[in-house]
């Protein structure tokens, strides 16, 4: 009787031991799976966040593209109307140019020395901007913002001259107080020979090699191409 009880006890011990081992293994497996699920969730969360961010960026980008597309479409429609017309004066500007009164303007985003800026404008069948009135001054100022920007006014050949031949003496001027000083101390062989808009819109003369932004201007006529 006693030995039978001992056998049963031994059997129970083995069963319990097996059960404990099996439970331990299951707990380990479950905690591993839990860890994996946690990691997977974190990964999915960050993926979702990234996708949301990408989607938001794509949306902003798409809006910009649509705006640009609408603007380009308007410009192209206008230019088509000109081409289909009878050669009368056109009223539109090339793509990425801004129209005001009888001119089209292009505002640079980078900086170049004055001679390179003028060369750039010439390659676009234009010239550095010639400011003819207070209204035009305000229009340009609004577009360039508080950044030095070259204009088409220079005294490199002696007297101050506008690049398109507009008479300087009788024309509009917006020099800052005590400018132009044509300061000769810079050792370049000449003075400060090129004019630019300053942060507040007033004009200053400066060394032509300074890397300022610039503004190109072309007339809104049938010869100015696009």
């Amino acid at each position: 009787q006693n030995s039978k009880l001992q056998e049963e006890l031994q059997a129970l011990r083995e069963t319990f031991s097996n059960l404990t081992a099996s439970t331990d293994a299951k707990v380990k497996t479950l905690s591993m799976q839990g860890g994996n699920v946690g990691r997977k969730m974190k990964s999915l969360e960050s993926q979702l966040e990234k996708q949301q961010q990408d989607l938001s960026e794509d949306h902003s980008s798409l809006l910009l593209h649509v705006k640009q597309f609408v603007s380009d479409l308007r410009s192209l429609s206008c230019q088509m109307a000109v081409l289909q017309g009878n050669g009368s004066e056109r009223t539109c500007c090339p793509v990425n140019w801004v129209g005001y009164e009888g001119s089209c303007y292009w505002f640079s985003r980078s900086g170049k020395p004055w001679p390179e800026a003028e060369k750039y404008c010439q390659l676009e069948n234009a010239h550095l901007v010639v400011v003819g009135s207070w209204e035009e001054q305000k229009f340009i100022q609004h577009h360039v913002g508080p950044v030095n920007s070259w204009i088409g006014l220079t005294d490199q050949s002696g007297p101050w001259k506008w690049v398109d031949g507009t008479d300087y003496e009788s024309g509009f001027k917006n020099w800052r107080p005590e400018q132009p000083d044509d300061w000769y101390g810079h050792g370049l062989g000449g003075g400060e020979d090129c004019a630019h808009f300053t942060e507040d819109g007033g004009w200053n003369d400066d060394i032509c090699q300074r890397p300022y932004r610039w503004v190109c201007e072309t007339q809104r006529d049938r010869d100015s191409g696009s």
């Epitope: 020395p113 030095n148 370049l188 060394i207 300074r210 890397p211 932004r213």
Partner: antibody, heavy 120, light 107 residues
Framework: QVQLVESGGGVVQPGRSLKLSCAAS????????MHWVRQAPGKGLEWVAV????????NYADSVKGRFTISRDNSKNTLCLQMNSLRAEDTAVYYC?????????????WGQGTTVTVSS | DIQMAQSPSSLSASVGDRVTITCRTS??????LAWFQQKPGKAPKSLLY???SLQGGVPSKFSGSGSGTDFTLTISSLQPEDFATYYC?????????FGGGTKVEIK
């Protein structure tokens, strides 16, 4: 107070890439141009790159042109320098520095620098 | 590129001395010149801009002059904290360029 803190330096093998960052605080970051300047061990200062206040204009020294890219995130007040195809001669302390204006004026504030070592 | 020649490359001076460092550029740069001070293991510190304008917080013992191609930095009365390396830099146009530096040491 006005502060610039560089990070991202380290040891890298020739031909590999590294990205430096510069965290700006204490001023309106989006209204100032920013520069990277480097200094090789025991040598003088060498200008590396500039980016204008609004990110529109970037200029580089000939020695890094085509390999380095300067960028900025005005919403995060952060300036970056992505350096690719690194060479032994790029080993230096890299400083970020603030332009006094939008990007074409003198430098007035400097970070403490981060060290880049290019070695096999 | 505009070359910058700084001289002397090093000098020994005593406390109280008047020290002058010169910087010459390969072409005229107007007044678009800055001066920096650098101590060992530290970042450069801006001293002057536009050739002669003092940065905020910089003592008036530092002064700058010149225009065109020839510039000078003067320390009117050298103090122990002024022993450092000084650099000139042009920012008239890109690429910005630095002089080779002048190390001011204690005599």
């Amino acid at each position: 107070q006005v502060q610039l803190v560089e990070s991202g330096g380290g040891v890298v093998q020739p031909g590999r890439s590294l990205k430096l960052s510069c965290a700006a605080s204490g001023f309106t970051f989006s209204t100032y141009g920013m520069h990277w300047v480097r200094q090789a061990p025991g040598k003088g200062l060498e200008w590396v790159a500039v980016i204008w206040y609004d990110g529109t204009n970037k200029n580089y020294a000939d020695s890094v042109k085509g390999r380095f890219t300067i960028s900025r995130d005005n919403s995060k007040n952060t300036l970056c320098l992505q350096m690719n195809s690194l060479r032994a001669e790029d080993t230096a302390v890299y400083y970020c520095a603030r332009d006094q204006g939008v990007g074409y004026d003198g430098l007035d504030v400097w970070g403490q620098g981060t060290t880049v070592t290019v070695s096999s | 590129d505009i070359q910058m020649a700084q001289s002397p490359s090093s000098l020994s001076a005593s406390v109280g001395d008047r020290v002058t460092i010169t910087c010459r550029t390969s072409q005229g740069i107007g007044k678009y010149l800055a001066w920096f001070q650098q101590k060992p293991g530290k970042a450069p510190k801006s001293l002057l801009y536009k050739a002669s304008s003092l940065q905020g917080g910089v003592p008036s013992k530092f002064s700058g002059s010149g225009s065109g191609t020839d510039f000078t930095l003067t320390i009117s009365s050298l103090q122990p904290e002024d022993f450092a390396t000084y650099y000139c830099q042009q920012y008239m146009t890109y690429p910005l360029t630095f002089g080779g530096g002048t190390k001011v040491e204690i005599k």
